[in-house]
Protein backbone atom coordinates (compact mmCIF):
# COMPACT_ATOMS: atom_id res chain seq x y z
CA UNK A 1 0.00 0.00 0.00
CA UNK A 2 1.14 3.56 -1.20
CA UNK A 3 1.26 6.48 1.68
CA UNK A 4 2.17 9.74 1.71
CA UNK A 5 1.25 12.65 4.73
CA UNK A 6 -1.54 14.20 4.31
CA UNK A 7 -2.37 17.40 2.53
CA UNK A 8 -1.40 20.32 4.46
CA UNK A 9 -5.05 21.80 5.09
CA UNK A 10 -5.38 18.34 6.96
CA UNK A 11 -2.87 19.30 9.86
CA UNK A 12 -5.91 19.73 12.29
CA UNK A 13 -7.54 16.68 11.18
CA UNK A 14 -6.20 14.03 13.40
CA UNK A 15 -7.45 15.30 16.60
CA UNK A 16 -5.07 12.28 18.79
CA UNK A 17 -2.99 10.93 15.75
CA UNK A 18 -1.31 11.59 12.73
CA UNK A 19 -3.02 12.00 9.44
CA UNK A 20 -1.62 9.64 6.63
CA UNK A 21 -2.78 9.90 2.63
CA UNK A 22 -3.71 5.95 1.52
CA UNK A 23 -2.72 6.53 -2.08
CA UNK A 24 -4.45 3.76 -3.55
CA UNK A 25 -7.51 3.90 -1.86
CA UNK A 26 -7.75 7.18 -1.96
CA UNK A 27 -8.04 8.00 1.27
CA UNK A 28 -7.00 10.18 4.32
CA UNK A 29 -6.72 8.01 7.20
CA UNK A 30 -5.75 9.22 10.77
CA UNK A 31 -3.03 6.74 12.78
CA UNK A 32 -4.34 7.04 16.14
CA UNK A 33 -2.34 7.89 19.04
CA UNK A 34 -2.18 4.72 22.40
CA UNK A 35 -5.96 5.09 24.07
CA UNK A 36 -7.38 7.09 21.18
CA UNK A 37 -9.77 6.00 18.75
CA UNK A 38 -12.63 7.51 16.16
CA UNK A 39 -12.56 8.56 12.41
CA UNK A 40 -10.69 11.67 13.72
CA UNK A 41 -8.92 10.35 17.11
CA UNK A 42 -11.75 12.11 18.60
CA UNK A 43 -12.80 9.37 21.75
CA UNK A 44 -10.22 8.32 24.39
CA UNK A 45 -10.72 5.08 26.27
CA UNK A 46 -8.93 3.47 28.74
CA UNK B 1 -26.56 6.83 0.71
CA UNK B 2 -24.14 9.75 2.02
CA UNK B 3 -26.31 12.88 0.87
CA UNK B 4 -25.63 17.01 1.08
CA UNK B 5 -28.92 18.46 0.70
CA UNK B 6 -29.01 22.64 0.32
CA UNK B 7 -31.90 24.80 1.42
CA UNK B 8 -34.11 26.46 -1.67
CA UNK B 9 -33.26 29.64 -3.84
CA UNK B 10 -33.43 32.61 -2.58
CA UNK B 11 -34.13 36.73 -3.87
CA UNK B 12 -32.47 38.97 -2.11
CA UNK B 13 -32.22 42.97 -2.15
CA UNK B 14 -28.63 44.81 -2.43
CA UNK B 15 -27.19 45.34 1.13
CA UNK B 16 -29.70 42.08 3.10
CA UNK B 17 -27.97 38.89 4.14
CA UNK B 18 -28.42 35.42 3.11
CA UNK B 19 -28.28 32.32 5.08
CA UNK B 20 -27.87 28.85 3.28
CA UNK B 21 -27.93 25.56 5.29
CA UNK B 22 -26.36 22.14 4.23
CA UNK B 23 -28.27 19.22 5.96
CA UNK B 24 -25.91 16.01 5.96
CA UNK B 25 -27.39 12.35 5.86
CA UNK B 26 -25.82 9.24 5.48
CA UNK B 27 -22.43 10.21 7.71
CA UNK B 28 -21.65 12.43 10.64
CA UNK B 29 -20.24 15.95 9.79
CA UNK B 30 -17.91 15.65 13.04
CA UNK B 31 -16.03 13.64 10.90
CA UNK B 32 -15.44 16.26 7.84
CA UNK B 33 -14.63 19.68 6.63
CA UNK B 34 -17.69 21.48 5.03
CA UNK B 35 -16.63 23.71 2.52
CA UNK B 36 -18.09 26.51 0.60
CA UNK B 37 -17.48 27.25 -3.04
CA UNK B 38 -19.58 29.58 -5.37
CA UNK B 39 -20.50 29.96 -8.90
CA UNK B 40 -21.69 33.22 -10.58
CA UNK B 41 -23.75 32.90 -13.77
CA UNK B 42 -20.98 32.36 -16.99
CA UNK B 43 -17.78 32.48 -13.98
CA UNK B 44 -15.45 29.85 -12.94
CA UNK B 45 -15.48 28.39 -9.45
CA UNK B 46 -14.77 30.35 -6.36
CA UNK B 47 -13.60 29.01 -2.85
CA UNK B 48 -15.13 31.10 -0.48
CA UNK B 49 -14.07 28.63 3.23
CA UNK B 50 -14.63 26.02 5.22
CA UNK B 51 -15.52 24.84 8.75
CA UNK B 52 -14.15 21.92 10.64
CA UNK B 53 -17.61 20.71 12.58
CA UNK B 54 -15.39 18.98 15.23
CA UNK B 55 -13.45 21.80 16.37
CA UNK B 56 -16.02 24.67 15.16
CA UNK B 57 -12.64 26.40 13.28
CA UNK B 58 -13.35 28.12 10.22
CA UNK B 59 -10.80 29.30 7.40
CA UNK B 60 -11.97 32.31 5.19
CA UNK B 61 -10.94 33.56 1.34
CA UNK B 62 -9.52 36.68 2.17
CA UNK B 63 -11.94 38.40 0.19
CA UNK B 64 -15.05 37.38 1.75
CA UNK B 65 -13.12 37.98 5.66
CA UNK B 66 -15.40 39.76 7.61
CA UNK B 67 -18.37 39.24 5.11
CA UNK B 68 -19.12 35.69 5.35
CA UNK B 69 -19.82 33.38 8.44
CA UNK B 70 -19.56 29.59 8.25
CA UNK B 71 -21.51 27.85 11.18
CA UNK B 72 -22.44 23.86 12.04
CA UNK B 73 -24.72 22.58 14.13
CA UNK B 74 -23.62 19.00 14.96
CA UNK B 75 -26.53 18.05 16.93
CA UNK B 76 -28.95 18.53 13.39
CA UNK B 77 -25.46 17.72 11.56
CA UNK B 78 -26.24 20.72 9.06
CA UNK B 79 -23.87 23.73 7.85
CA UNK B 80 -24.29 26.99 7.07
CA UNK B 81 -23.45 29.82 4.85
CA UNK B 82 -24.03 33.18 6.08
CA UNK B 83 -22.93 36.40 3.39
CA UNK B 84 -23.89 39.82 4.40
CA UNK B 85 -24.06 43.19 2.58
CA UNK B 86 -24.87 41.21 -0.29
CA UNK B 87 -24.71 43.08 -3.49
CA UNK B 88 -25.57 42.48 -7.29
CA UNK B 89 -22.00 40.54 -8.10
CA UNK B 90 -23.03 38.19 -5.44
CA UNK B 91 -25.37 36.71 -7.33
CA UNK B 92 -24.48 32.67 -7.56
CA UNK B 93 -24.91 29.01 -7.29
CA UNK B 94 -23.65 28.42 -3.75
CA UNK B 95 -22.22 25.19 -3.19
CA UNK B 96 -21.31 23.53 0.28
CA UNK B 97 -18.55 20.49 -0.12
CA UNK B 98 -17.51 17.67 2.19
CA UNK B 99 -14.25 16.73 2.48
CA UNK B 100 -12.09 15.12 5.13
CA UNK B 101 -11.62 10.85 4.86
CA UNK B 102 -12.48 11.03 1.31
CA UNK B 103 -12.27 13.39 -1.39
CA UNK B 104 -14.88 15.96 -2.05
CA UNK B 105 -18.62 15.26 -2.46
CA UNK B 106 -21.30 17.84 -3.56
CA UNK B 107 -24.55 19.49 -2.73
CA UNK B 108 -27.07 20.15 -5.18
CA UNK B 109 -26.07 23.77 -4.91
CA UNK B 110 -28.44 27.24 -4.37
CA UNK B 111 -29.30 29.85 -6.49
CA UNK B 112 -28.78 32.96 -4.36
CA UNK B 113 -29.89 36.36 -6.54
CA UNK B 114 -29.71 39.32 -5.22
CA UNK B 115 -31.68 42.00 -7.34
CA UNK B 116 -33.54 45.17 -6.00
CA UNK C 1 -3.17 32.05 -0.76
CA UNK C 2 -1.83 29.41 -3.43
CA UNK C 3 -2.75 31.12 -6.96
CA UNK C 4 -3.86 28.47 -10.13
CA UNK C 5 -2.81 29.55 -13.03
CA UNK C 6 -4.99 27.60 -15.90
CA UNK C 7 -4.08 28.01 -19.71
CA UNK C 8 -5.67 27.74 -22.07
CA UNK C 9 -8.75 29.48 -21.50
CA UNK C 10 -10.27 28.21 -24.39
CA UNK C 11 -9.70 25.86 -27.36
CA UNK C 12 -11.28 24.19 -30.04
CA UNK C 13 -10.23 20.90 -31.03
CA UNK C 14 -11.67 17.95 -33.66
CA UNK C 15 -13.23 14.87 -32.75
CA UNK C 16 -9.98 12.20 -31.57
CA UNK C 17 -7.97 15.30 -30.81
CA UNK C 18 -5.21 14.99 -28.39
CA UNK C 19 -6.40 17.67 -25.81
CA UNK C 20 -4.11 19.06 -23.15
CA UNK C 21 -4.68 21.52 -19.94
CA UNK C 22 -2.02 22.95 -17.54
CA UNK C 23 -2.67 24.20 -14.57
CA UNK C 24 1.01 26.33 -12.48
CA UNK C 25 0.66 26.95 -8.75
CA UNK C 26 2.21 29.86 -7.15
CA UNK C 27 4.09 27.90 -4.97
CA UNK C 28 4.37 23.61 -4.80
CA UNK C 29 1.20 21.89 -4.08
CA UNK C 30 2.63 18.27 -3.55
CA UNK C 31 0.58 16.34 -6.11
CA UNK C 32 -2.72 17.51 -4.52
CA UNK C 33 -4.54 18.93 -7.66
CA UNK C 34 -8.10 17.55 -8.85
CA UNK C 35 -9.48 18.21 -12.16
CA UNK C 36 -13.36 18.94 -12.80
CA UNK C 37 -15.36 18.69 -15.63
CA UNK C 38 -18.44 20.80 -15.62
CA UNK C 39 -21.21 21.09 -18.09
CA UNK C 40 -23.75 23.97 -18.58
CA UNK C 41 -26.78 23.53 -16.01
CA UNK C 42 -24.82 20.94 -13.72
CA UNK C 43 -22.53 20.57 -11.13
CA UNK C 44 -18.92 20.25 -11.45
CA UNK C 45 -17.90 16.39 -11.98
CA UNK C 46 -14.99 14.84 -10.71
CA UNK C 47 -12.72 13.25 -12.93
CA UNK C 48 -9.27 12.96 -11.18
CA UNK C 49 -7.71 13.63 -7.64
CA UNK C 50 -4.36 13.17 -6.44
CA UNK C 51 -2.74 14.34 -9.93
CA UNK C 52 -3.62 11.01 -11.83
CA UNK C 53 -5.72 9.44 -9.55
CA UNK C 54 -8.88 8.72 -11.96
CA UNK C 55 -12.51 8.73 -10.46
CA UNK C 56 -14.66 5.42 -10.98
CA UNK C 57 -16.70 5.17 -13.60
CA UNK C 58 -14.42 7.99 -15.72
CA UNK C 59 -13.31 6.83 -19.29
CA UNK C 60 -9.72 6.24 -19.28
CA UNK C 61 -9.07 8.42 -21.98
CA UNK C 62 -8.72 11.09 -19.40
CA UNK C 63 -5.43 11.65 -17.14
CA UNK C 64 -3.54 13.32 -15.48
CA UNK C 65 0.46 14.29 -14.50
CA UNK C 66 2.77 17.01 -13.26
CA UNK C 67 4.89 17.58 -9.82
CA UNK C 68 5.26 20.76 -7.70
CA UNK C 69 4.41 23.46 -9.21
CA UNK C 70 3.06 22.19 -13.15
CA UNK C 71 0.32 19.99 -13.93
CA UNK C 72 -1.26 19.01 -17.22
CA UNK C 73 -4.87 17.44 -18.14
CA UNK C 74 -5.23 15.08 -21.16
CA UNK C 75 -7.79 13.95 -23.10
CA UNK C 76 -6.11 11.54 -25.28
CA UNK C 77 -8.86 11.43 -28.00
CA UNK C 78 -11.83 14.24 -27.75
CA UNK C 79 -15.19 13.33 -27.87
CA UNK C 80 -18.32 14.78 -28.43
CA UNK C 81 -19.81 14.08 -25.04
CA UNK C 82 -16.51 15.70 -23.53
CA UNK C 83 -17.59 19.32 -24.75
CA UNK C 84 -17.46 21.24 -21.36
CA UNK C 85 -15.78 23.18 -19.21
CA UNK C 86 -12.81 21.95 -17.04
CA UNK C 87 -11.13 23.06 -13.88
CA UNK C 88 -7.90 22.38 -11.65
CA UNK C 89 -8.26 22.60 -8.14
CA UNK C 90 -5.28 22.57 -5.76
CA UNK C 91 -6.09 21.48 -2.29
CA UNK C 92 -2.84 21.30 -0.83
CA UNK C 93 -3.40 24.39 1.35
CA UNK C 94 -7.14 25.42 1.34
CA UNK C 95 -7.98 25.21 -1.87
CA UNK C 96 -7.73 27.33 -5.31
CA UNK C 97 -9.65 26.82 -8.34
CA UNK C 98 -8.28 27.37 -12.12
CA UNK C 99 -10.16 29.65 -14.47
CA UNK C 100 -11.25 27.24 -16.72
CA UNK C 101 -10.55 26.08 -20.23
CA UNK C 102 -13.67 25.89 -22.40
CA UNK C 103 -13.45 22.96 -24.65
CA UNK C 104 -15.43 22.69 -27.85
CA UNK C 105 -15.59 20.64 -31.08
CA UNK C 106 -13.95 22.25 -33.96
Known amino acids: VSITKCNSDMNGYCLHGQCIYLVDMSQNYCRCEVGYTGVRCEHFYL | QDQLVQSGAEVKNPGASVKVSCKAS????????IQWVRQAPGQGLEWMGR????????KYREKFEGRVTITADTSTNTAYMELSSLRSEDTAVYYC?????????WGQGTLVTVSS | DIQMTQSPSSLSASVGDRVTITCRAS??????IAWYQQKPGQAPRLLIQ???TLQPGVPSRFSGSGSGTDYTFTISSLQPEDIATYYCLQYDNLRTFGGGTKVEIK
Open chain 2, 51 to 58: IDPLRRQT
Open chain 3, 50 to 52: YTS
Open chain 2, 97 to 105: VRSGREFDF
Open chain 3, 27 to 32: QDIHKY
Open chain 2, 26 to 33: GFNIKDTY
